[in-house]
Protein backbone atom coordinates (compact mmCIF):
# COMPACT_ATOMS: atom_id res chain seq x y z
CA UNK A 1 0.00 0.00 0.00
CA UNK A 2 1.01 3.61 -0.44
CA UNK A 3 2.11 5.96 2.31
CA UNK A 4 3.77 9.29 2.92
CA UNK A 5 6.93 9.81 4.93
CA UNK A 6 6.89 12.64 7.44
CA UNK A 7 9.80 14.16 9.32
CA UNK A 8 10.17 17.27 11.49
CA UNK A 9 9.19 20.39 9.55
CA UNK A 10 11.43 22.65 11.62
CA UNK A 11 15.21 22.40 11.97
CA UNK A 12 16.40 20.17 14.80
CA UNK A 13 19.06 21.75 16.99
CA UNK A 14 21.94 19.96 18.70
CA UNK A 15 25.12 20.89 20.51
CA UNK A 16 28.54 19.62 19.47
CA UNK A 17 29.38 16.50 21.50
CA UNK A 18 25.74 15.82 22.43
CA UNK A 19 23.43 13.25 20.94
CA UNK A 20 20.48 14.11 18.73
CA UNK A 21 17.37 12.24 17.65
CA UNK A 22 15.86 12.55 14.16
CA UNK A 23 12.29 11.18 14.07
CA UNK A 24 10.53 9.96 10.97
CA UNK A 25 7.12 8.33 10.45
CA UNK A 26 4.88 7.01 7.73
CA UNK A 27 1.30 8.09 7.18
CA UNK A 28 -0.96 6.24 7.46
CA UNK A 29 0.96 4.51 10.22
CA UNK A 30 1.50 0.78 9.83
CA UNK A 31 3.99 -1.87 10.87
CA UNK A 32 7.33 -1.06 9.22
CA UNK A 33 9.30 -3.97 10.71
CA UNK A 34 9.52 -5.63 7.31
CA UNK A 35 10.39 -2.46 5.43
CA UNK A 36 13.76 -1.02 4.52
CA UNK A 37 14.29 2.17 6.52
CA UNK A 38 17.24 4.50 6.30
CA UNK A 39 18.78 7.91 6.46
CA UNK A 40 21.18 9.36 3.94
CA UNK A 41 22.73 12.77 3.36
CA UNK A 42 22.13 14.61 0.14
CA UNK A 43 23.56 15.52 -2.31
CA UNK A 44 25.87 12.51 -2.49
CA UNK A 45 23.56 10.01 -0.77
CA UNK A 46 26.09 9.01 1.87
CA UNK A 47 24.41 6.38 4.05
CA UNK A 48 23.97 7.50 7.65
CA UNK A 49 22.05 4.41 8.78
CA UNK A 50 20.29 1.54 7.05
CA UNK A 51 17.82 -1.01 8.42
CA UNK A 52 16.91 -3.93 6.17
CA UNK A 53 15.62 -7.49 6.66
CA UNK A 54 14.93 -6.71 10.31
CA UNK A 55 18.57 -5.76 10.98
CA UNK A 56 20.81 -2.70 11.01
CA UNK A 57 23.16 -2.88 8.02
CA UNK A 58 26.34 -1.41 9.51
CA UNK A 59 28.47 -2.36 6.51
CA UNK A 60 26.68 0.12 4.25
CA UNK A 61 27.34 3.09 6.52
CA UNK A 62 29.54 6.03 5.59
CA UNK A 63 32.73 5.81 7.72
CA UNK A 64 32.01 9.09 9.54
CA UNK A 65 28.81 7.60 11.01
CA UNK A 66 30.11 4.15 11.90
CA UNK A 67 29.57 3.47 15.60
CA UNK A 68 27.75 6.78 16.12
CA UNK A 69 24.19 5.88 15.11
CA UNK A 70 21.36 3.83 16.50
CA UNK A 71 17.88 3.22 15.13
CA UNK A 72 15.23 3.47 17.87
CA UNK A 73 12.54 1.01 16.92
CA UNK A 74 10.20 0.96 19.93
CA UNK A 75 7.37 2.38 17.77
CA UNK A 76 8.26 0.73 14.45
CA UNK A 77 5.05 -1.29 14.73
CA UNK A 78 3.20 2.01 14.21
CA UNK A 79 5.52 3.13 11.41
CA UNK A 80 7.54 5.46 13.64
CA UNK A 81 11.33 5.31 13.88
CA UNK A 82 14.04 7.58 15.21
CA UNK A 83 17.70 7.89 14.29
CA UNK A 84 19.94 8.70 17.24
CA UNK A 85 23.32 10.23 16.41
CA UNK A 86 25.87 10.33 19.21
CA UNK A 87 28.81 12.69 19.65
CA UNK A 88 27.42 15.29 17.24
CA UNK A 89 30.01 17.05 15.08
CA UNK A 90 29.90 20.34 13.20
CA UNK A 91 30.12 18.28 10.00
CA UNK A 92 26.71 16.75 10.84
CA UNK A 93 25.02 20.09 10.20
CA UNK A 94 22.76 20.23 7.18
CA UNK A 95 20.24 18.06 5.43
CA UNK A 96 19.26 14.47 6.12
CA UNK A 97 16.76 12.37 4.20
CA UNK A 98 14.77 9.58 5.80
CA UNK A 99 13.19 6.93 3.60
CA UNK A 100 10.89 3.93 3.94
CA UNK A 101 10.88 1.28 1.23
CA UNK A 102 8.17 -1.39 1.04
CA UNK A 103 8.98 -3.80 -1.79
CA UNK A 104 9.30 -1.47 -4.80
CA UNK A 105 7.45 1.46 -3.23
CA UNK A 106 9.64 4.13 -1.62
CA UNK A 107 8.93 7.53 -0.13
CA UNK A 108 11.19 9.93 1.72
CA UNK A 109 11.26 13.10 3.78
CA UNK A 110 13.94 15.73 4.22
CA UNK A 111 14.93 17.26 7.53
CA UNK A 112 17.56 19.71 8.70
CA UNK A 113 20.01 19.53 11.57
CA UNK A 114 21.55 22.69 13.03
CA UNK A 115 24.69 22.15 15.10
CA UNK A 116 25.75 24.72 17.65
CA UNK A 117 28.87 25.21 19.75
CA UNK A 118 27.98 24.86 23.45
CA UNK A 119 30.55 27.52 24.31
CA UNK A 120 29.83 30.10 21.62
CA UNK A 121 27.96 32.38 24.00
CA UNK A 122 30.72 32.58 26.65
CA UNK A 123 32.27 36.04 26.52
CA UNK A 124 36.09 36.09 26.38
CA UNK A 125 38.14 37.10 29.43
Amino acid sequence: GQFRVIGPRHPIRALVGDEVELPCRISPGKNATGMEVGWYRPPFSRVVHLYRNGKDQDGDQAPEYRGRTELLKDAIGEGKVTLRIRNVRFSDEGGFTCFFRDHSYQEEAAMELKVEDPFYWVSPG
Epitope: P8, H10, E21, P23, R25, P28, D74
Partner: antibody, heavy 120, light 107 residues
Framework: QVQLVQSGAEVKKPGSSVKVSCKAS????????ISWVRQAPGQGLEWMGG????????NYAQKFQGRVTITADKSTSTAYMELSSLRSEDTAVYYC?????????????WGQGTTVTVSS | DIQMTQSPSTLSASVGDRVTITCRAS??????LAWYQQKPGKAPKLLIY???SLESGVPSRFSGSGSGTEFTLTISSLQPDDFATYYC?????????FGQGTKVEIK
Protein backbone atom coordinates in the same frame (compact mmCIF):
# COMPACT_ATOMS: atom_id res chain seq x y z
CA GLN B 1 1.13 1.06 25.21
CA VAL B 2 1.53 4.72 26.16
CA GLN B 3 -0.43 5.89 29.21
CA LEU B 4 -0.73 9.36 30.67
CA VAL B 5 -1.99 9.46 34.26
CA GLN B 6 -2.93 12.83 35.75
CA SER B 7 -3.20 14.00 39.34
CA GLY B 8 -6.56 14.29 41.10
CA ALA B 9 -9.23 16.99 41.19
CA GLU B 10 -8.44 20.32 42.85
CA VAL B 11 -10.58 23.06 44.44
CA LYS B 12 -8.85 26.42 44.60
CA LYS B 13 -9.55 29.95 45.75
CA PRO B 14 -9.41 32.87 43.31
CA GLY B 15 -5.91 34.38 43.16
CA SER B 16 -4.18 31.12 44.14
CA SER B 17 -2.22 28.68 41.94
CA VAL B 18 -2.71 25.08 40.94
CA LYS B 19 -0.14 22.53 39.79
CA VAL B 20 -1.32 19.48 37.84
CA SER B 21 0.93 16.51 37.06
CA CYS B 22 0.93 14.06 34.16
CA LYS B 23 2.95 10.86 34.52
CA ALA B 24 3.84 9.00 31.33
CA SER B 25 4.48 5.31 31.00
CA UNK B 26 5.12 3.12 27.98
CA UNK B 27 7.31 4.30 25.12
CA UNK B 28 10.25 6.61 25.70
CA UNK B 29 9.66 9.90 27.51
CA UNK B 30 12.35 11.55 25.37
CA UNK B 31 10.19 10.82 22.33
CA UNK B 32 7.25 12.85 23.69
CA UNK B 33 6.15 16.41 23.34
CA ILE B 34 3.56 17.06 26.07
CA SER B 35 0.85 19.67 25.68
CA TRP B 36 -1.82 20.90 28.06
CA VAL B 37 -5.33 21.42 26.75
CA ARG B 38 -8.24 22.67 28.81
CA GLN B 39 -11.98 22.46 28.47
CA ALA B 40 -14.32 24.74 30.39
CA PRO B 41 -17.77 23.28 31.26
CA GLY B 42 -19.81 22.86 28.07
CA GLN B 43 -17.07 24.47 25.99
CA GLY B 44 -14.52 23.37 23.38
CA LEU B 45 -10.83 22.46 23.61
CA GLU B 46 -8.18 25.11 24.17
CA TRP B 47 -4.43 24.57 23.87
CA MET B 48 -2.48 26.21 26.70
CA GLY B 49 1.10 25.29 25.91
CA GLY B 50 3.52 22.44 25.57
CA UNK B 51 7.00 21.19 26.30
CA UNK B 52 9.56 18.92 24.64
CA UNK B 53 11.05 17.14 27.67
CA UNK B 54 14.40 16.33 26.02
CA UNK B 55 14.99 20.07 25.62
CA UNK B 56 13.02 21.32 28.60
CA UNK B 57 11.85 24.29 26.57
CA UNK B 58 8.18 25.24 26.82
CA ASN B 59 5.95 27.16 24.45
CA TYR B 60 2.77 28.91 25.58
CA ALA B 61 -0.41 30.16 23.98
CA GLN B 62 -0.43 33.96 24.03
CA LYS B 63 -3.58 33.98 26.16
CA PHE B 64 -1.80 32.19 29.03
CA GLN B 65 1.65 33.74 28.70
CA GLY B 66 2.93 34.86 32.09
CA ARG B 67 0.30 32.89 33.99
CA VAL B 68 1.17 29.31 33.04
CA THR B 69 4.39 27.36 33.59
CA ILE B 70 4.95 23.96 32.02
CA THR B 71 7.86 21.82 33.18
CA ALA B 72 9.00 18.21 32.81
CA ASP B 73 11.02 15.89 35.02
CA LYS B 74 12.78 13.34 32.81
CA SER B 75 13.82 11.24 35.82
CA THR B 76 10.19 10.49 36.71
CA SER B 77 8.68 10.84 33.19
CA THR B 78 6.30 13.46 34.56
CA ALA B 79 5.13 16.75 33.09
CA TYR B 80 3.61 19.56 35.16
CA MET B 81 1.36 22.49 34.43
CA GLU B 82 1.10 25.33 36.95
CA LEU B 83 -1.51 28.03 36.48
CA SER B 84 -1.36 31.09 38.71
CA SER B 85 -3.67 34.01 39.56
CA LEU B 86 -6.67 31.73 39.26
CA ARG B 87 -10.09 33.16 38.50
CA SER B 88 -13.51 31.57 38.19
CA GLU B 89 -13.15 31.34 34.39
CA ASP B 90 -10.27 28.90 34.93
CA THR B 91 -12.73 26.29 36.20
CA ALA B 92 -12.22 23.53 33.67
CA VAL B 93 -10.98 20.04 32.98
CA TYR B 94 -7.26 20.12 32.21
CA TYR B 95 -5.84 17.44 29.95
CA CYS B 96 -2.27 16.53 29.14
CA UNK B 97 -1.76 15.10 25.66
CA UNK B 98 1.19 13.60 23.84
CA UNK B 99 2.58 14.38 20.42
CA UNK B 100 5.14 11.95 19.03
CA UNK B 101 8.48 13.71 19.26
CA UNK B 102 7.80 17.17 17.94
CA UNK B 103 4.93 19.61 17.90
CA UNK B 104 4.46 18.64 14.24
CA UNK B 105 2.14 15.80 15.11
CA UNK B 106 -1.42 15.13 16.33
CA UNK B 107 -2.26 14.34 19.95
CA UNK B 108 -2.32 10.55 19.86
CA UNK B 109 -2.58 9.88 23.62
CA TRP B 110 -4.44 11.85 26.29
CA GLY B 111 -4.54 11.84 30.06
CA GLN B 112 -7.85 11.18 31.81
CA GLY B 113 -8.27 14.85 32.73
CA THR B 114 -8.03 16.79 35.99
CA THR B 115 -10.97 18.89 37.15
CA VAL B 116 -9.94 22.24 38.62
CA THR B 117 -12.68 24.23 40.34
CA VAL B 118 -12.00 27.85 41.24
CA SER B 119 -14.46 29.11 43.82
CA SER B 120 -14.42 31.44 46.79
CA ASP C 1 -3.24 32.12 15.40
CA ILE C 2 -4.95 30.02 12.77
CA GLN C 3 -8.72 29.95 13.28
CA MET C 4 -10.60 26.70 12.73
CA THR C 5 -14.31 26.85 11.95
CA GLN C 6 -16.51 23.78 12.06
CA SER C 7 -19.96 23.32 10.62
CA PRO C 8 -22.55 22.48 11.59
CA SER C 9 -22.39 23.08 15.35
CA THR C 10 -25.05 20.43 15.93
CA LEU C 11 -26.13 17.64 13.67
CA SER C 12 -29.18 15.41 14.21
CA ALA C 13 -28.92 12.04 12.51
CA SER C 14 -30.17 8.47 12.69
CA VAL C 15 -28.31 5.18 12.91
CA GLY C 16 -27.19 4.19 9.40
CA ASP C 17 -27.04 7.76 8.10
CA ARG C 18 -24.02 9.09 6.23
CA VAL C 19 -22.71 12.08 8.16
CA THR C 20 -20.32 14.81 6.99
CA ILE C 21 -18.69 17.47 9.15
CA THR C 22 -16.72 20.35 7.63
CA CYS C 23 -13.75 22.21 9.02
CA ARG C 24 -12.27 25.38 7.52
CA ALA C 25 -8.91 26.92 8.37
CA SER C 26 -8.30 30.66 8.21
CA UNK C 27 -5.12 29.99 6.19
CA UNK C 28 -3.59 27.02 4.42
CA UNK C 29 -2.50 24.24 6.78
CA UNK C 30 -1.52 21.77 4.05
CA UNK C 31 -2.61 18.36 5.42
CA UNK C 32 -1.76 19.03 9.06
CA LEU C 33 -5.23 18.37 10.41
CA ALA C 34 -6.59 15.90 12.95
CA TRP C 35 -10.11 14.87 13.94
CA TYR C 36 -11.05 13.82 17.49
CA GLN C 37 -14.13 12.25 19.02
CA GLN C 38 -15.14 13.15 22.56
CA LYS C 39 -17.82 11.63 24.74
CA PRO C 40 -19.15 13.31 27.92
CA GLY C 41 -16.72 13.03 30.83
CA LYS C 42 -14.01 11.46 28.66
CA ALA C 43 -10.80 12.68 27.05
CA PRO C 44 -10.80 13.27 23.28
CA LYS C 45 -9.80 10.32 21.11
CA LEU C 46 -7.78 10.66 17.90
CA LEU C 47 -9.67 9.40 14.84
CA ILE C 48 -7.94 10.87 11.79
CA TYR C 49 -4.54 12.54 11.40
CA UNK C 50 -2.67 14.12 8.47
CA UNK C 51 -6.15 14.98 7.12
CA UNK C 52 -6.92 11.49 5.81
CA SER C 53 -4.97 8.83 7.77
CA LEU C 54 -7.07 6.59 9.99
CA GLU C 55 -5.67 6.09 13.48
CA SER C 56 -4.99 2.48 14.42
CA GLY C 57 -8.05 0.77 15.93
CA VAL C 58 -10.55 3.30 14.57
CA PRO C 59 -13.41 1.76 12.52
CA SER C 60 -13.12 2.19 8.75
CA ARG C 61 -16.52 3.91 8.58
CA PHE C 62 -14.60 7.06 9.61
CA SER C 63 -12.72 8.86 6.85
CA GLY C 64 -11.14 12.25 6.36
CA SER C 65 -10.35 14.30 3.29
CA GLY C 66 -9.21 17.73 2.20
CA SER C 67 -6.10 19.87 2.16
CA GLY C 68 -5.23 23.55 2.29
CA THR C 69 -8.15 25.24 4.05
CA GLU C 70 -11.13 22.91 3.59
CA PHE C 71 -11.51 19.52 5.30
CA THR C 72 -14.25 16.99 5.93
CA LEU C 73 -14.86 14.12 8.32
CA THR C 74 -17.28 11.51 7.02
CA ILE C 75 -18.98 8.71 8.92
CA SER C 76 -20.25 6.37 6.19
CA SER C 77 -22.90 4.65 8.32
CA LEU C 78 -23.59 6.14 11.72
CA GLN C 79 -23.52 3.66 14.60
CA PRO C 80 -25.00 4.07 18.13
CA ASP C 81 -21.46 4.45 19.51
CA ASP C 82 -20.77 7.43 17.22
CA PHE C 83 -23.10 9.91 18.96
CA ALA C 84 -20.52 12.30 20.42
CA THR C 85 -18.82 15.64 19.82
CA TYR C 86 -16.20 15.89 17.07
CA TYR C 87 -13.35 18.41 16.93
CA CYS C 88 -10.91 19.28 14.18
CA UNK C 89 -7.43 20.55 15.10
CA UNK C 90 -4.59 22.04 13.07
CA UNK C 91 -0.96 21.32 13.86
CA UNK C 92 0.53 23.35 11.04
CA UNK C 93 2.08 25.73 13.52
CA UNK C 94 3.22 25.32 17.10
CA UNK C 95 0.18 26.95 18.51
CA UNK C 96 -2.36 24.27 17.71
CA UNK C 97 -5.97 25.35 17.50
CA PHE C 98 -9.24 23.43 17.57
CA GLY C 99 -12.57 23.94 15.90
CA GLN C 100 -15.48 24.74 18.21
CA GLY C 101 -16.87 21.22 17.90
CA THR C 102 -19.79 19.48 16.20
CA LYS C 103 -22.25 17.59 18.37
CA VAL C 104 -23.78 14.59 16.62
CA GLU C 105 -27.05 13.76 18.33
CA ILE C 106 -29.84 11.26 17.80
CA LYS C 107 -32.64 12.51 15.57
Amino acid sequence: QVQLVQSGAEVKKPGSSVKVSCKASGGTFSSYAISWVRQAPGQGLEWMGGIIPIFGTANYAQKFQGRVTITADKSTSTAYMELSSLRSEDTAVYYCAREWYWPDNPFDYWGQGTTVTVSS
Amino acid sequence: DIQMTQSPSTLSASVGDRVTITCRASQSISSWLAWYQQKPGKAPKLLIYDASSLESGVPSRFSGSGSGTEFTLTISSLQPDDFATYYCQQYHEYSPTFGQGTKVEIK
